[in-house]
Interface confidence: low
């Protein structure tokens, strides 16, 4: 079928443009070109006929067109004009026509944009500036860049007009960048030259440095303003309120005592019309001062308060130093220092924290040290303790007890018998007890400072005879070969012998075993399952004795190496197997079996009816402590022959 | 060795609720303050809140105040950020850091759990 190809289909004005023709037919006799979609006469372009070679310029010709013998078409200087289509009129040599319609588009070649502004200066935080991308062109594309990047997403951009006008509301510094709008039609792109947003901002409020406020006699002050601005800040000083200079920069050389006061910055913007100050004010020492500490608790309690001590003064360009008695910090994550070593805080400070604490301000040549510090942590009252340590006593003695407890500042003490205030002493004396004197004695210590209260009680026995004593455990079920059990034999009695019996000998020697706090304790170290016996403890003295009940040790142990029974290993088929496992263990093992390593049963026998050389394999007897957390288990073969067959000879022999 | 680990971040809807926790090693969370800090992009690094468990001392930012909630457990050595009533804004990577009493000064920190508030 008759084609036509335009090559290309977007056209830029002044250029050219081919109408190609496709699959023309054989035997023409000639051929035509009209604008348009149809055959008109009055729109003829160019004839031509194939005999004669001869081309003939139509009402349509404007001089810019040459038809080729392959019936295309070049269009040269193409005008906006030339859009649209273009028909070509084929009459064969039997005089039949055929007729093809192709069509091509011309576009502008755009020209360079630019960038116009309704605002060359906005404000920040008050002006919008709308951007407009010149000249306005017809059918095409406005595309912007904001720093060569495509445009962010923002409440505050806002594109219209055909995206040919660009706004930006309530600008801010963020916003100075550049600017570039491209425009885009089918045959050409043109990209503006940059425009830099000139955002008006500030001043800021100025900052003042070096930080610093403190100085020495005789050094320089040299203080710089800085303060965010556009355009740049005036800056102006002024030292206790009066005028001083128009400088970025305050130099004041050999300083004394008399420069010590207030020292205001002004930045001002002569474009936004405002105004920002600050104000530092600086001390000028006569001499290097001697450093002294201060705290922000003299009277921290423990566990509860935090400290900060602060060396004094601050100065400029000075190292401070600390020590904690007469040596360097040590590292703690309860001690900080802050960034400029000035202060040392104290986290949740302890009784231990008392110090000496001292800072030191490195100069020159020396090092001033500050007088120590020491910190009056406050504590307690601990749990007191009462001494001695008896509860039993002999009827006619005198009773002296004694109360103790750790506390800043000391304890308050009081004693209480059977819940009824006695004395607010230390020392409870009582002379020549009777059997009257038994009771409960309470020590109660306070601290005022904290307002906390710690109390002991103590229950004290007078008898002229003994008590039945008792056996107290720190284990009750050891493990074998790995705990140590300690008895102790109770009462703690005054003037008392204390004596002790195993399965009612006296006590075997062995390293194994050991006496202590006065025979009152009886130690058995790494137990053994022999260690299992009947303990009994005895109290004696001038007057009576008496005999504990048996305490009987408990030692855990194995489980050991189990024994299958029986021990036959071989067996004739029919049979019945019926195999025991036993283990040596305290509590009694748990039992498993497994057969060519398939678990079987829990059970400490395993029962199989009528055996055939299938069950032919080996056998495991697992065991498992659960107290001791220990394992153990054996492993037997068993070998299963056919009837009438004895072990190891082949059958018909 | 000090170890800070924080856990409980996620995606949660504007007026929605998480609780942070952070759980602390190497130390007593007695002896110390604890804080929660947290930074998001083209924001300034923010201390949220800070609590010192051995007197129960709190302090908050004036952007969270009445919304969370901080808190310690000293038996599990770890503490806690309640935050209520989430805006976009809280939007952040959380980190739990040990904070000075004094200067709110902060160190040791956590590896961070990360916080978004959309709809």
């Known amino acids: 079928k008759l084609t036509i190809e335009s090559t290309p289909f977007n056209v830029a004005e002044g250029k050219e443009v081919l109408l190609l023709v496709h699959n023309l037919p054989q035997h023409l006799f000639g051929y035509s070109w009209y604008k348009g979609e149809r055959v008109d006469g009055n729109r003829q372009i160019i004839g031509y006929v194939i005999g004669t070679q001869q081309a003939t310029p139509g009402p349509a010709y404007s001089g810019r067109e040459i038809i080729y013998p392959n019936a295309s078409l070049l269009i040269q200087n193409i005008i906006q004009n030339d859009t649209g289509f273009y028909t070509l009129h084929v009459i064969k040599s039997d005089l039949v026509n055929e007729e093809a319609t192709g069509q091509f588009r011309v576009y502008p070649e755009l020209p360079k944009p630019s960038i116009s502004s309704n605002n060359s200066k906005p404000v920040e935080d008050k002006d919008a500036v709308a951007f407009t991308c010149e000249p306005e062109t017809q059918d095409a594309t406005y595309l912007w860049w904001v720093n060569n990047q495509s445009l962010p997403v923002s409440p505050r951009l806002q594109l219209s007009n055909g995206n040919r006008t660009l706004t930006l509301f309530n600008v801010t510094r963020n916003d100075t960048a550049s600017y570039k709008c491209e425009t885009q039609n089918p045959v050409s792109a043109r990209r503006s030259d940059s425009v830099i947003l000139n955002v008006l901002y500030g001043p800021d409020a100025p900052t003042i440095s070096p930080l610093n406020t403190s100085y020495r006699s005789g050094e320089n002050l040299n203080l710089s303003c800085h303060a965010a601005s556009n355009p740049p800040a005036q800056y102006s000083w002024f030292v206790n309120g009066t005028f001083q200079q128009s400088t970025q920069e305050l130099f004041i050389p050999n300083i004394t005592v008399n420069n010590s006061g207030s020292y205001t910055c002004q930045a001002h913007n002569s474009d936004t019309g405002l105004n920002r100050t600050t104000v530092t004010t600086i001390t000028v020492y006569a001499e290097p001062p001697k450093p002294f500490i201060t705290s922000n608790n003299s009277n921290p309690v423990e566990d509860e308060d935090a400290v900060a001590l602060t060396c004094e003064p601050e100065i400029q360009n000075t190292t401070y130093l600390w020590w904690v008695n007469n040596q360097s910090l040590p590292v703690s994550p309860r001690l900080q220092l802050s960034n400029d070593n000035r202060t040392l805080t104290l986290l949740s400070v302890t009784r231990n924290d008392v110090g000496p604490y001292e800072c030191g301000i490195q100069n020159e040549l020396s090092v001033d040290h500050s007088d120590p510090v020491i910190l009056n942590v406050l504590y307690g009252p601990d749990d007191p303790t009462i001494s001695p340590s008896y509860t039993y006593y002999r009827p006619g003695v005198n009773l002296s007890l004694s109360c103790h407890a750790a506390s800043n500042p000391p304890a308050q003490y009081s004693w209480l018998i059977d819940g009824n205030i006695q004395q607010h002493t230390q020392e409870l004396f009582i002379s020549n007890i009777t059997e009257k004197n038994s009771g409960l004695y309470t020590c109660q210590a306070n601290n005022s400072a904290s307002g906390h209260s710690r109390t002991t009680v103590k229950t004290i026995t007078v008898s002229a005879e003994l008590p039945k004593p008792s056996i107290s455990s720190n284990n009750s079920k050891p493990v074998e070969d790995k705990d140590a059990v300690a008895f102790t034999c109770e009462p703690e009695a005054q003037n008392t012998t204390y004596l002790w019996w195993v399965n009612g000998q006296s006590l075997p020697v062995s390293p194994r075993l050991q006496l202590s706090n006065g025979n009152r304790t009886l130690t058995l170290f790494n137990v053994t399952r022999n260690d299992a016996r009947a303990y009994v403890c005895g109290i004696q003295n001038s007057v009576s004795a008496n005999r504990s009940d048996p305490v009987t040790l408990d030692v855990l142990y194995g489980p050991d190496t189990p024994i299958i029974s029986p021990p036959d290993s071989s067996y004739l088929s029919g049979a019945n197997l019926n195999l025991s496992c036993h283990s040596a263990s305290n509590p009694s093992p748990q039992y498993s079996w497994r057969i060519n390593g398939i678990p079987q049963q829990h059970t400490q026998v395993l029962f199989i009816a009528k055996i055939t050389p299938n069950n032919n394999g080996t056998y495991a007897c697992f065991v498992s402590n659960l107290a001791t957390g220990r394992n153990n288990s054996i492993v037997k073969s068993i070998t299963v022959s056919a009837s009438g067959t004895s072990p190891g000879l082949s059958a018909g022999a | 060795e000090v170890q800070l680990v924080e856990s409980g971040g996620g995606l949660v809807q504007p007026g929605g609720s998480l609780r942070l926790s952070c759980a602390a090693s190497g130390f007593n969370i007695k002896d110390t303050c604890i804080g929660w800090v947290r930074r998001a992009p083209g924001k300034e690094e923010e201390l949220v809140a800070d609590?010192?468990?051995?007197?129960?001392?709190?302090r908050y930012a004036d952007s969270v105040k009445g919304r969370f909630t901080i808190s310690a457990d000293t038996s599990k050595n770890t503490a806690y950020l309640q935050m209520n009533s989430l805006r976009a804004e809280d939007t952040a990577v959380y980190y739990c850091a040990i904070v000075s009493k004094i200067d709110q000064y902060y160190n040791y920190w956590g590896q961070g759990t990360t916080v978004t508030v959309s709809s």
């Open positions: 609590i010192c468990p051995s007197y129960g001392g709190t």
